[in-house]
């Protein structure tokens, strides 16, 4: 079968980093600078990806794969493959439309990206503040305050929240 | 790839409970917020339930005191445990996750009728 | 905790521009984001942020705002893009939600 499609088709002996130049009587050609084909058989090199401006080189374009961007230091990536950047802020602010903005009292955000979220309520799981929130940080909730009676063990405070969507997976 | 898938939805009558899933795969729950929606028919999105990843919960005074939301860590599914169900509550309901100032990605959806 | 208002019906004639508006107070410190749901279907972002679009999105949509609106514009509507349109916007309260009440888009 791979013989017949051959003849029918001289492209699909092309291989990645090449494509089929019907310039040159389908002539498997290397892919020009700048340029490459991740798959065999193409008709044309696509353009590598630039990484300019805001974005830097994570990964070099070849002649089989395309250059991957990261953002410079004070951005962080948005979409799919890093398509774009977003202004970094400091943990206890959020991002609006006029620049990062401190959180509001009662406001918390742990990371650099995201928004400024309300602590949580201890007293609505009859529970108890141990550790009052900041701008940073949420509040960590205790023993409710019936609970707590002489030599009672404190509770451990759970790690800080991760950022939505940018956490390890 | 980034997705969530529902399931769960049905008939059922007033007063009564259900519980709806939404599994994701491309993301760990636990690690993000996340939120259940609803949309009634022929009506827009109204906001249900939030977790955070603390496990923090909150929700729209509309379900509170009748609907929780959970989730289940080991098997990265979201949970929405509905009881006392009305008629009101008739509606599609969506997870999603909540990357702060939008939502993506959204489950498909899954139709919860509540009615004699 | 504030309100997004929406025109509830616009239509476009096939590859002509149409430009979808909401209006509220969060629009004066957040950005919108915007999604499309067709009949039968989930909501799928199509907007978010300043003016970012999702991969496999066209870039016949972007976005826009100005002071307490924010505009989704489709420059040469297709036939695929008749749907509702909802903005979206954090409220003050971060964990409260706010979206407006949809837009039917007709492409004639």
């Known amino acids: 079968f791979e013989r017949t499609r051959s003849l029918q088709d001289p492209c699909s002996n092309c291989p990645a980093g090449t494509f089929c130049d019907n310039n040159r009587n389908q002539i498997c050609s290397p892919c020009p600078p700048n340029s490459f084909s991740s798959a065999g058989g193409q008709r044309t090199c696509d353009i590598c990806r630039q990484c300019k401006g805001v974005f830097r080189t994570r990964k070099e374009c070849s002649s089989t794969s395309n250059a991957e961007c990261d953002c410079t230091p004070g951005f962080h990536c948005l979409g799919a493959g890093c398509s774009m950047c977003e202004q970094d802020c400091k943990q206890g602010q959020e991002l609006t439309k006029k620049g990062c903005k401190d959180c509001c009292f009662g406001t918390f955000n742990d990371q650099k990206r995201g928004i400024c979220r309300p602590w949580t309520n201890c007293s609505l799981d009859g529970k108890s503040v141990l550790v009052n929130g900041t701008k940073e940080r949420d509040v960590v909730c205790g023993p409710s305050p019936a609970d707590l009676s002489p030599g009672a063990s404190s509770v451990t405070p759970p790690a800080p929240a991760r950022e939505p969507g940018h956490s390890p997976q | 790839q980034v997705q969530l898938v529902q399931s769960g939805g049905g008939l059922i009558q007033p007063g009564g409970s259900l519980r709806l899933s939404c599994a994701a795969s491309g993301f760990t729950v636990s690690n993000n917020y996340m939120r259940w929606v609803r949309q009634a028919p022929g009506k827009g999105l109204e906001w249900v339930s939030l977790i955070y990843s603390t496990g923090t919960t909150y929700y729209a005074d509309s379900v509170k005191g009748r609907f929780t939301i959970s989730r289940d860590n080991s098997k990265n599914t979201l949970y929405l445990q509905m009881n006392s169900l009305r008629a009101e509550d008739t509606a599609v309901y969506y997870c999603?996750?909540?990357?702060?100032?939008?939502?993506?990605?959204w489950g498909q959806g899954t139709l919860v009728t509540v009615s004699s | 905790s504030s309100e997004l208002t929406q025109d509830p019906a616009v239509s476009v004639a096939l590859g002509q521009t149409v430009r979808i508006t909401c209006q509220g107070d969060s629009l004066r410190s957040y950005y919108a984001s915007w999604y499309q749901q067709k009949p039968g279907q989930a909501p799928v972002l199509v907007i978010y942020g300043k003016n970012n679009r999702p991969s496999g999105i066209p870039d016949r949509f972007s976005g826009s705002s100005s002071g307490n609106t924010a505009s989704l514009t489709i420059t040469g509507a297709q036939a695929e893009d008749e749907a509702d349109y909802y903005c979206?916007?954090?409220?003050?309260?971060?964990?409260?939600?706010?979206f407006g009440g949809g837009t039917k888009l007709t492409v004639l």
């Open positions: 999603a996750r909540d990357r702060g100032q939008w939502f993506d990605p």
């Open positions: 979206h916007s954090r409220d003050s309260n971060g964990n409260h939600v706010i």
